[in-house]
Interface confidence: low
């Protein structure tokens, strides 16, 4: 079953500044994201921001900036003028919707012992499901491996022999690349037919669009601009990682997320995918 992760991050530079990061671990396509605080929107929570692939974003105070980070993750920066932050013990919830019957919601908060500015993978909290723990363990190994690789590269740099240093690569980029397979693995674990939406195929096996082209939405033409729109979810500063129940719904029709410059919408997206696997048998 698709999962949503939520991470609350305290900025190292401003202790009263917070950012909420949310991601969807697939396999669906995102149509709408709602971020709320104090609980789920409509169940005691207050809406902070809504992000739509085509129609853009809107936010309400104390939200400062909501943006897409990748095709399956978003971030929301929060304003906080007070020295003693009201966000410290607040629950933040993210709801990813994929109409007509896909909507998943999870919540998270800043851990009590927050040490801002640390670059480390999200820490699994106790409620993390056992089947995901193994995957996260694997991602830990991958992270360690990448760290070790980086160490070797740095050692190589200090030798008189010709250097083999990759251009534009830093430890954070390596970490991000190491983290991405973990997400893909989690999605595949829950749905044997899962494909993380890098191909942006409109896998609408249960729907039909007026123009007959596999329900390609009108809002499939926009991609978040800037460096944040990378294909892998970046590693975020230490915070909570919450993988709660699969929110409200499972999808019966999916649509591609925003696509844009440098990203191609593949014309033949009706490849060998099992209908059962996509829509219900999990």
């Amino acid at each position: 079953t698709p999962e949503v992760w939520v991470q609350v991050q305290m900025e190292a530079t401003e202790l009263s500044s917070f950012t909420v990061h949310c991601g969807f671990l697939g396999p669906g396509s995102i149509s709408l994201v709602t971020v709320s605080w104090g609980g789920p929107d409509g169940a005691g929570g207050t809406k902070l921001a809504v992000l739509h692939p085509e129609l853009g974003t809107r936010q309400w105070a104390p939200a400062r900036q909501a943006r897409w980070e990748t095709q399956s993750s978003i971030s929301l920066a929060l304003e906080d003028s007070g020295a003693s932050s009201p966000f410290a013990n607040t629950t933040f919830c993210c709801k990813f919707a994929s109409f007509p019957e896909g909507s998943w919601e999870s919540c998270g908060s800043l851990p009590p012992s927050s040490d801002p500015g640390l670059s480390a993978p999200p820490t699994p909290v106790p409620i993390l499901r056992a089947d995901l723990a193994g995957i996260l363990g694997l991602s830990g190994v991958l992270l360690f491996g990448c760290g070790y690789l980086l160490h070797l590269l740095r050692r190589q740099k200090h030798r008189p022999t010709p250097r083999l240093q990759p251009s534009h690569t830093n430890s954070q980029a390596l970490t991000a690349q190491a983290w991405a397979p973990s997400q893909a693995s989690q999605a595949a674990l829950h749905d044997p037919y899962a494909t993380i939406n890098t191909s942006f195929c409109p896998a609408t096996l249960d729907t039909a669009h007026p123009n007959g082209w596999a329900s390609l939405p009108t809002h499939a033409a926009h991609q978040p601009q800037g460096p944040a729109a990378s294909a892998s979810t970046p590693i975020l500063a230490r915070g909570s990682f919450v993988s709660v129940e699969n929110g409200l719904y499972t999808q019966a029709g999916e649509r591609p997320p925003h696509t844009g410059p440098g990203l191609t919408l593949f014309p033949d997206c009706r490849g060998p995918r099992a209908v059962e696997g996509r829509f219900g048998v999990r």
Partner: antibody
Framework: EVQLVESGGGLVKPGGSLRLSCAAS????????LSWVRQAPGKGLEWVSE????????YYPDTVTGRFTISRDNAKNTLYLQMSSLRAEDTAVYYC????????WGQGTLVTVSS | DIQMTQSPSSLSASVGDRVTITCKAS??????VAWYQQKPGKAPKLLIY???YRFTGVPSRFSGSGSGTDFTLTISSLQPEDFATYYC?????????FGGGTKVEIK
């Protein structure tokens, strides 16, 4: 084939209680969110409550908050609506529905609140 | 709560006619609007979701359009089986709210 079958409707006095059930089949019940929607005789549709796939999240409109409780038993593939402090204006056909929006509906069960 | 105002409340049309039903939301719901068809004594059926996407098995003569606060359901060529009541619904946020309905009758 997706099937939703409601039961438990009937005649009840104002202030009374009633528990509706919705038996589901033809899909993986535990993977889907479910709702109750009602329709008073000759009137339009009104959403009554919603529950997430595992039962963690529940939602209600103000008109029924505190009086109605939605729940589910994923082992039995059954959705419930416990209604208490019933009023005459709660008289309606109650449908259970799957999804967001409501892709599949049951046939409905009539609840009549009258003295 | 978001109010959905549907118009007209009823209309008379003939087989083959083009029929348009409108729905206005009290606030911006982006594209999160669905349309249902209901016949007497039967449960509603989902026709359109997210403004313009036809649900499983829905004929191509049904189409939806709009964005923000104004939405339209169009039946391009009315068929005998299309005489029913149609409802719009916003699925943008809870509480879910429906329009008052439009009854399409035979002229």
């Amino acid at each position: 084939e997706v099937q939703l079958v409601e039961s438990g409707g009937g005649l009840v006095k104002p202030g009374g209680s009633l528990r509706l059930s919705c038996a589901a089949s033809g899909f993986t019940f535990s993977s889907y969110g479910l709702s109750w929607v009602r329709q008073a005789p000759g009137k339009g549709l009104e959403w009554v409550s919603e529950i997430s796939s595992g039962g963690t999240y529940t939602y209600y409109p103000d008109t029924v908050t505190g009086r109605f409780t939605i729940s589910r038993d994923n082992a039995k593939n059954t959705l419930y609506l416990q209604m208490s402090s019933l009023r005459a204006e709660d008289t309606a056909v109650y449908y259970c529905a799957r999804g967001d929006p409501f892709g599949y509906w049951g046939q409905g069960t009539l609840v009549t609140v009258s003295s | 709560d978001i109010q959905m105002t549907q118009s007209p409340s009823s209309l008379s049309a003939s087989v083959g006619d083009r029929v348009t039903i409108t729905c206005k939301a009290s606030q911006d719901v982006m594209t999160a609007v669905a349309w249902y068809q209901q016949k007497p004594g039967k449960a509603p059926k989902l026709l359109i979701y997210s403004t313009s996407y036809r649900f499983t098995g829905v004929p191509s003569r049904f189409s939806g359009s709009g964005s923000g606060t104004d939405f339209t359901l169009t039946i391009s060529s009315l068929q005998p089986e299309d005489f029913a009541t149609y409802y719009c619904q916003q699925h943008y946020s809870t509480p879910r709210t429906f329009g008052g309905g439009t009854k399409v009758e035979i002229k």
